[in-house]
């Protein structure tokens, strides 16, 4: 592990209580094809353990969704990935809205530091799919 | 090649016969910007030759498509990437539907083993674009 | 840097004048979370300085956009990433249209050579968002 090949791929565990927009993640071979090699989970949120530039990627699919599902609702459904702690480093890294679509997927390179905790906030009132091939979240250390 | 930097980027060759939802891929410098360095093609399907964690990515665009193209059809058009052989390891890795959209694109990290053959199944009755900047599929070994 | 870990993540600076469909990028720690480590910017366009296979990724979100924004316009809004110079290597690498959606995001592996300049052409009459979590463009060297 000293090479710095920190990497994680997570599957959705559950959504938060009503006023908590965060998605809660889980990972490990016993669960399927998810894993944590370096980063760790803190109450379902991903915590970075090594400084560096990371490729962050995510896909979220809304449950039992058709193209009209998202347009039925007054408030747009949006997914934002950000650093939520420490508070001094809080920032939104990646944001997408579901516009008459049922899936968002994206990726980006970003510097992360040891101790950064990443949150994935799903705003709106639609439940995400827990299917492991439809909703997942991962990071990959790519260089110092 | 001993570093394990296995990598491939493929372009669409053709779709299967009617009852075969698989997309058939091709790769090589003579074809354009596609290539295979480590993985290999077996009858248009990508076969892994080195164990490890891979970044799998795909983009598929539907041919001559407008925002109404997908809504014209009763059955949803869905793209699934999975391990299709060996049968004992068969699993769907990544799945997206075209909901009033013409392109899906996503990526994920997943463990793959030597001999795993990846299939990309396009269900529905819409032809995918063969333009090399619109439809492509690739894998990149990222760590053991 | 001799390892060849060239990498860049850029944020949108501005769009071009009316007849210039190119997006103009900027990067550097002073601007936020964007950076250039190896590649360089030439008048807002990304220039490669090391041969190799790169992972190219992009996300573009249209400004003040709803699902009806893109359908209001006669001409489709399309994003294309390509090599624009040298002219002898000019090619489109990745292309997506906004079909009743407000964001496109994708990635692909492609061989690039020292001196290749990448352009990101946004056709149509809609302005892209300059929010750094909504619109970004990056490359990562992955192998020789």
């Amino acid at each position: 592990e000293s090479l710095g090949w920190d990497i994680a791929e997570l599957q959705l565990n559950h959504t938060g209580p009503q006023q908590d927009p965060r998605l809660y993640w889980q990972g490990g071979p016993a669960l399927g094809r998810s894993f944590l090699r370096g980063p760790e989970l803190d109450k379902g949120q991903l915590r970075i353990r090594r400084d560096g530039i990371y490729m962050v990627h995510i896909q979220v699919t809304l449950a039992i969704c058709s193209s009209t599902s998202t347009s039925r609702h007054h408030h747009p459904t949006t997914l934002a990935v950000g650093i939520c702690s420490p508070a001094s480093r809080s920032i939104s890294l990646l944001r997408l809205s579901f516009h008459q679509g049922c899936t968002i997927a994206s990726q980006r390179l970003t510097p992360l530091a040891r101790g950064d905790t990443l949150c994935t906030n799903l705003t709106g009132t639609l439940l995400p799919s827990r299917n492991t091939d439809e909703t997942f979240f991962g990071v990959q250390w790519v260089r110092p | 090649e001993s570093l394990g930097w296995d990598i491939a980027e493929l372009q669409l060759n053709h779709t299967g016969p009617q009852q075969d939802p698989r997309l058939y891929w091709q790769g090589g410098p003579a074809l354009g910007r596609s290539f295979l360095r480590g993985p290999e093609l077996d009858k248009g399907q990508l076969r892994i030759r080195r164990d490890g964690i891979y970044m799998v990515h795909i983009q598929v665009t539907l041919a001559i498509c407008s925002s109404t193209s997908t809504s014209r059809h009763h059955h949803p058009t869905t793209l699934a990437v999975g391990i299709c052989s060996p049968a004992s390891r068969s699993i769907s890795l990544l799945r997206l539907s075209f909901h009033q959209g013409c392109t899906i694109a996503s990526q994920r990290l997943t463990p793959l083993a030597r001999g795993d053959t990846l299939c990309t199944n396009l269900t529905g009755t819409l032809l995918p674009s063969r333009n090399t900047d619109e439809t492509f599929f690739g894998v990149q070994w990222v760590r053991p | 840097e001799s390892l060849g870990w060239d990498i860049a993540e850029l944020q949108l600076n501005h769009t071009g004048p009316q007849q210039d469909p190119r997006l103009y990028w900027q990067g550097g720690p002073a601007l936020g979370r964007s950076f250039l480590r190896g590649p360089e910017l030439d008048k807002g366009q990304l220039r490669i300085r090391r041969d190799g296979i790169y992972m190219v990724h992009i996300q573009v979100t249209l400004a003040i956009c709803s699902s009806t924004s893109t359908s209001r316009h006669h001409h489709p809004t399309t994003l294309a990433v390509g090599i624009c110079s040298p002219a002898s290597r000019s090619i489109s690498l990745l292309r997506l249209s906004f079909h009743q959606g407000c964001t496109i995001a994708s990635q692909r592996l492609t061989p690039l050579a020292r001196g290749d300049t990448l352009c990101t052409n946004l056709t149509g009459t809609l302005l892209p968002s300059r929010n750094t979590d909504e619109t970004f463009f990056g490359v990562q060297w992955v192998r020789p």
Partner: antibody, heavy 120, light 111 residues
């Protein structure tokens, strides 16, 4: 096997409407689209419109105002109605199945045709 | 609308010989890595029958003596060797965009 059978009148009065029913067998209207094409000595083969598996229609622009294509999936029937017929609408009218690929827009099986004369 | 011009309007070919029919579009019918040109055969008193789709692919049950070629705007249907049952009118059709349009037809007669 795949079949499309058409039924409808042979003679229509000017300014009246034409209704043709296309009853299909060997395939489902929830999977395949059905096109309508007419053929006349003066204009050759002319595409009129199509109804897709989801019930959405596309029409040839000159006919939008007076053409309606509907269907009943459970009865495997497609209904063609054209209003305000004139003498130059005299033609053979065909229904035809869209090819398996929904965006190929080729027609792989055709009805036998309905010969329509517009005359008083 | 895309206009398809067929030539010749008619031709007479001996049994066993080659028949060549041309179809020219006034703009490209290529898109998405395909060329959206198809060919039909129509015999008197019958509906058209799909022969070839996407320039060169034979429809189900069509004999191999039929072949199609071309790209962009110029297309050719070849029949070789011509058999007695091939006497018919042949139409090209594009499906690049709506409206779909057909050529005016080429009547093949046997000498």
């Amino acid at each position: 096997q795949v079949q499309l059978k058409q039924s409808g009148p042979g003679l229509v009065q000017p300014s009246q409407s034409l209704s043709i029913t296309c009853t299909v067998s060997g395939f489902s209207l929830t999977t395949y689209g059905v096109h309508w094409v007419r053929q006349s000595p003066g204009k050759g083969l002319e595409w009129l419109g199509v109804i897709w598996s989801a019930g959405i229609t596309d029409y040839n622009a000159p006919f939008i105002s007076r053409l309606s294509i509907t269907k009943d999936n459970s009865k495997s029937q497609v209904f063609f109605k054209m209003n305000s017929l004139q003498a130059d609408d005299t033609a053979i009218y065909y229904c035809a199945r869209n090819d398996y690929y929904g965006n190929l827009y080729a027609m792989d099986y055709w009805g036998q045709g309905t010969s329509v004369t517009v005359s008083s | 609308d895309i206009v398809l011009t067929q030539s010749p309007a008619s031709l007479a070919v001996s049994l066993g010989q080659r028949a060549t029919i041309s179809c020219r579009a006034n703009k490209s019918v290529s898109a998405s890595g395909y060329t959206f040109m198809h060919w039909y055969q129509q015999k008197p008193g019958q509906p058209p029958k799909l022969l070839i789709y996407l320039v060169s692919n034979l429809a189900s049950g069509v004999p191999a003596r039929f072949s199609g070629s071309g790209s962009g705007t110029d297309f050719t249907l070849n029949i070789h060797p011509v058999e007695g049952e091939d006497a018919a009118t042949y139409y090209c059709q594009h499906s690049r965009e709506f409206p779909l349009t057909f050529g005016a037809g080429t009547k093949l007669e046997l000498k």
